[in-house]
């Protein structure tokens, strides 16, 4: 007989796919031709692009009023007139509706100032969140983005209260809260009173780029949180090209689209934008790359394989990774809430397996080293539920010049300086 | 509803001045980018001109550059088009129009028409 | 400039027939291309956009599709209310947006 189908976790929107951050929303329209409309209305023609990318959420802004450390001139339920109107806000919701995309707005409240928070007017402040919460729930948001927690004084104890408000509106909703901080201690208190938050951290951000290290990083957290759902980026609010170098994106982006939790990109992050590549653009928030058109500020300054029109026609490019990674992740059961292990395969890899009752399995295999490597897979290190065939399919490369779709041998794997293979093999009773 | 009502069209002598407006209601004008767009007699459509929403940004087909002017007043919900020098050439019904921006991967829903005014430049 | 042609400049066809209309772009426009219909002594009507969505309210006997230079309209099944001209547009990346020259399509 059959062995009997393993039960589906409850499963909500935000664990279905990735995340994406557009904190800037003038940046992600582009100079020139891309800026006919306000940055809302904007937002609200690009949303077909973002449906491609196959992300479930959108983490907008912030976009109300604030007028810098001015708490008095700080209204969380008004939009900025620079951003659009609240009819332009309204018209996005109930066209992301229709294409299933969620938004969450970001309500850090003092976000054109020096902190945050307003250090010295907590209360007020934490008055003004808990109204705009209420306010925009009622007005359709899916959820909400708190970022700087570091500044905000009894964080965990707000953070609590304004998950009560927010689950208390609907399950559905969710609260993501961004940290600076990359210590663990500290991001485990902050998870320890809010069983449902989700947290983005500067983690991952020191991962020091080899395989070890960021193995024992992830290892440590996932065993550290337990069961709980997490998410994976590399900082609260930046882009991956802030942290790492070009020839690390794809491995990445492999990685955090394939570890266990909800994968966080910031706009730009599909195409690799470096901001130090765009002389006069500020690195917190450089102007997407639409096409050539995007940053008229220095001609010749940007080439076609830079921006989303030209990888949008190649294949090969990291745009067309990122597509890829998002489609397997938000259909395949083993990595939509599939069981993780990781595995040794020697120095210099981080390797870990991704499988779900009697579905398809994953095995990822990254090299962070700037040398090929033959990975020794260490199937000793794995649960009897989770062994190691002979063979699997290759289903990505991140480098070019492997077959998709052909069998490797898993015991004479070699990989390529920052080489990331995606591998699928299918359930053995 | 949404609406675009163009005025102002006329017939004028070649090398003199017209000046269009398009008021808009029912939508959020202050927060779309806006065109011209023109058909002569018997033709096909012509692109003109486009501003963006705040006015910052201002576009022209080649044969009026220089000549035409593209200007909103978002206080009033109105468009312009000031045109200058005028042309045989440019006889024509003129549209003002929301068609969304020309940038790749950029597809505008809000895609609205007025019902045009002529302009006929004859000696 | 990217040039669009359309053909053909003109079509006859009986209500209840299925018409199919061309237009290619003179390099590669991806799927950014838009679809009108305008009747005379009246505003274009906004029909498809991004080469194959049609826009709310059109009626589903249109469809669009291709992608790159080669594109189509097509009317599964005409009815009265079609008899027009319609244009295709192009909106790729920068200024100027171009239109095709134009299809009419009258009763036969």
């Known amino acids: 007989r059959a062995p009997r189908c393993r039960e589906l976790p409850a499963q909500k929107w935000w664990h279905t796919g990735a995340l994406y951050r557009i904190g800037d929303l003038q940046a992600f329209q582009g100079h020139g031709a891309g800026n006919l409309a306000a940055p809302i209305s904007g937002l609200k023609g690009r949303l077909d692009y973002l449906s491609s990318l196959k992300v479930k959420g959108l983490v907008l802004g912030p976009i109300h009023k604030n007028q810098k450390d001015d708490v008095a001139q700080t209204d969380l339920l008004q939009i900025d007139p620079n951003f659009g109107s609240k009819e332009d806000f309204d018209s996005l919701l109930q066209s992301a509706k229709k294409k299933s995309i969620r938004v969450i707005l970001d309500l850090t409240p003092n976000y054109r100032g020096e902190n945050s928070w307003f250090s010295t007017q907590v209360d007020t402040v934490a008055t003004k969140v808990k109204d705009a919460l209420e306010f925009w729930l009622q007005a359709g948001v899916d959820g909400f983005q708190v970022r700087d927690i570091e500044n905000l004084k009894d964080a965990s104890s707000f953070l609590a209260e304004w998950q009560n408000i927010t689950k208390g509106f609907s399950e559905d909703r969710l609260l993501i809260a961004g940290t600076n901080s990359s210590d663990l201690q500290q991001i485990l208190s902050l998870l320890e009173s809010n069983k449902d938050l989700l947290l983005t951290s500067s983690y991952l951000s020191d991962s020091g780029s080899t395989g070890e290290h960021t193995k024992s990083l992830v290892t440590q957290y996932l065993n550290a949180t337990g069961n709980r759902w997490c998410s994976w980026s590399l900082s609260q609010a930046r882009l991956l090209t802030s942290f790492l170098p070009a020839q690390l994106l794809r491995l990445y982006q492999l990685m955090l689209f394939t570890l266990p939790g909800t994968p966080v990109f910031s706009y730009g992050d599909e195409i690799g934008l470096d901001a130090a590549a765009l002389p006069g653009q500020p690195m917190e928030a450089p102007v997407m790359l639409w096409d050539e058109s995007s940053f008229p500020d220095i001609p010749g300054a940007v080439s076609a394989n830079m921006t989303v029109k030209g990888q949008s026609e190649d294949p090969g490019s990291l745009l067309s990774l990122f597509r890829r990674l998002s489609d397997q992740r938000s259909k395949e059961r083993s990595l939509l809430h599939g069981d993780f292990h990781a595995f040794s395969a020697g120095p210099g890899l981080f390797s870990y397996i991704r499988h779900w009752d009697q579905n398809e399995r994953f095995l990822v295999v990254l090299n962070f080293g700037d040398v090929g490597l033959s990975a020794g897979l260490q199937a000793s290190d794995l649960p009897a539920s989770a062994s190691l065939p002979a063979k699997a399919d290759l289903l990505l490369s991140t480098q070019p010049g492997r077959e998709e779709g052909s069998p490797l041998e898993l015991e004479r794997l070699k990989l390529e300086p920052h080489e990331g293979l995606l591998l699928r093999f299918p359930y053995a009773a | 509803q949404v609406q675009l009502v163009e005025s102002g069209g006329g017939v004028v002598q070649p090398g003199r001045s017209l000046r269009l407006s398009c008021a808009a209601s029912g939508f959020t004008f202050s927060s779309y980018g806006m065109h011209w767009v023109r058909q002569a007699p018997g033709k096909g459509l012509e692109w003109v001109a486009l501003i963006s929403y705040d006015g910052s940004n201002k576009y022209y087909t080649d044969s009026v550059k220089g000549r035409f002017t593209i200007s909103r007043d978002n206080s009033k919900n109105t468009l312009y088009l000031q045109m200058n020098s005028l042309r045989a050439e440019d006889t024509a019904v003129y549209f003002c129009?929301?068609?969304?921006?020309?940038?790749?991967?950029?597809?505008?829903?809000?895609?609205?028409w007025g019902l045009g005014t002529t302009v006929t430049v004859s000696s | 400039d990217i040039q669009m042609t359309q053909s053909p400049s003109s079509l006859s066809a009986s209500v209840g027939d299925r018409v199919t209309i061309t237009c290619r772009a003179s390099?590669?426009?991806?799927?950014?291309l838009n679809w009108y219909q305008q009747k005379p002594g009246k505003a274009p009507k906004f029909l498809i956009y991004?080469?194959?969505s049609l826009q709310s309210g059109v009626p589903s006997r249109f469809s669009g599709s291709g992608s790159g230079t080669d594109f189509t309209l097509t009317i599964s099944s005409l009815q009265p209310e079609d008899f027009a001209t319609y244009y295709c547009?192009?909106?790729?990346?920068?200024?100027?947006?171009?239109f095709g020259q134009g299809t009419r399509l009258e009763i036969k």
């Open positions: 547009q192009q909106s790729y990346s920068t200024p100027p947006i171009t």
């Open positions: 390099q590669s426009i991806s799927s950014s």
């Open positions: 129009a929301s068609l969304g921006a020309p940038t790749y991967s950029y597809f505008s829903d809000m895609d609205v």
């Open positions: 991004a080469a194959s």
